[in-house]
């Protein structure tokens, strides 16, 4: 690991093992400012391996709203605009952090949370198993 | 909004307004037990918009690590193995939450950040503008 | 905004040559490439010739290759299509593209005739 100078100006922290509890500021910086979301929001139904977007939503949660992709097809859309099963649609899944109200419906007290989610689909070519 | 009631042994938060600070325990909990990771780690390969992944590592942050998607090619990989540039590749991103040391140098003082990454590739058809 | 400047089309004779050059000015990105597709009414638009901003790399339909040459002035952002041999067949509007990932502009187009 990368060894971190530690700013004097710093708050005082109790506890200095792991498990540790931070203070985070809850102020969300956005630092996707050169983006333009308009250019890939009609991916999912562009794509050869087009998916729906389906709203997962948790109280419990921060963020409490994610949405998850669900491929449409098996197989992937051909230049004729036909399901190809000779070739497959899959998730690309990736791990997010999240916040968990920890103890459950506390405000102010959370637990780092990882979770899996699928992002949007993919054309692959599948991997043939000759099976007894 | 969703009105999440009150757990009354929750910890005391000396700001109740946002901009708000509020306490995170960094023991990550992991829900991803279902997964295979196996199964989706060569899609950036096998796929007709393959993508190499690029590790972005800024220690100011946490996760510290974060791997980026670049499409290899502008076009896709068609059955026969090449390029179709009538198709294109593009980058399917995600909007994640990531801790921000702040002060910088902090090790127990976080701001959250929102970030935009690339996760992997999909095959689009092109919108065709007619320019002047 | 994007903006596609073509020139270069004309009456030529089966065997003959002509160069078609078109400038791009607007964004660009490092993943993107200009070229040539071509239409004749009725039929399907065909990609001609296209090369990468960045890498280079260059593409030919099969009817072309060893006949059409696609090169790229990096300074101004033109683009040439050499094209040599030229046959009935060729004749068609030729639109010069921009193919950034997932948005391709086409310019007016520049009418290409071969007679025989």
């Known amino acids: 690991g990368i060894t971190i100078p530690r700013n004097p100006g710093c708050p005082n922290s109790e506890d200095k093992n792991f498990p540790r509890t931070v203070m985070v500021n809850l102020n969300i910086h956005n630092r996707n400012t050169n983006t333009n979301p308009k250019r890939s929001s009609d991916y999912y139904n562009r794509s050869t391996s087009p998916w729906n977007l389906h709203r997962n939503e948790d109280p419990e949660r921060y963020p409490s709203v994610i949405w998850e992709a669900k491929c449409r097809h098996l197989g992937c859309i051909n230049a004729d605009g036909n399901v190809d099963y000779h070739m497959n649609s899959v998730p690309i899944q990736q791990e997010i952090l999240v916040l968990r109200r920890e103890p459950p419906h506390c405000p102010n007290s959370f637990r780092l949370e990882k979770i899996l989610v699928s992002v949007g689909c993919t054309c692959v070519t599948p991997i043939v198993h000759h099976v007894a | 909004g969703i009105t999440i009631p009150r757990n009354p042994g929750c910890p005391n938060s000396e700001d109740k307004n946002f901009p708000r600070t509020v306490m995170v325990n960094l023991n990550i909990h992991n829900r991803n037990t279902n997964t295979n990771p196996k199964r989706s780690s060569d899609y950036y390969n096998r796929s007709t918009s393959p993508w190499n992944l690029h590790r972005n590592e800024d220690p100011e942050r946490y996760p510290s690590v974060i791997w980026e998607a670049k499409c290899r090619h502008l076009g896709c990989i068609n059955a026969d193995g090449n390029v179709d540039y009538h198709m294109n590749s593009v980058p399917i991103q995600q909007e994640i939450l990531v801790l921000r040391r702040e002060p910088p140098h902090c090790p127990n003082s976080f701001r959250l950040e929102k970030i935009l990454v690339s996760v992997g590739c999909t095959c689009v058809t092109p919108i065709v503008h007619h320019v002047a | 905004q994007v903006q596609l400047v073509e020139s270069g089309g004309g009456l030529v004779r089966t065997g003959g040559s002509l160069r078609l050059s078109c400038s791009v000015s607007g964004d660009i990105s490092s993943q993107s490439a200009m070229g040539w597709y071509r239409q004749v009414p009725g039929r399907q638009r065909e990609l001609v010739a296209m090369?990468?901003?960045?890498?280079?790399?260059?593409y030919y339909a099969d009817s072309v290759k060893g006949r059409f040459t696609i090169s790229r002035i990096n300074a101004n952002n033109t683009i040439y299509l050499q094209m040599n041999n030229l046959k009935p067949e060729d004749t068609a509007i030729y639109y010069c593209t921009h193919n950034e990932p997932g948005d391709l502009y086409m310019g007016q187009g520049t009418q290409v005739t071969v007679s025989s």
């Open positions: 090369i990468h901003t960045t890498k280079g790399d260059t």
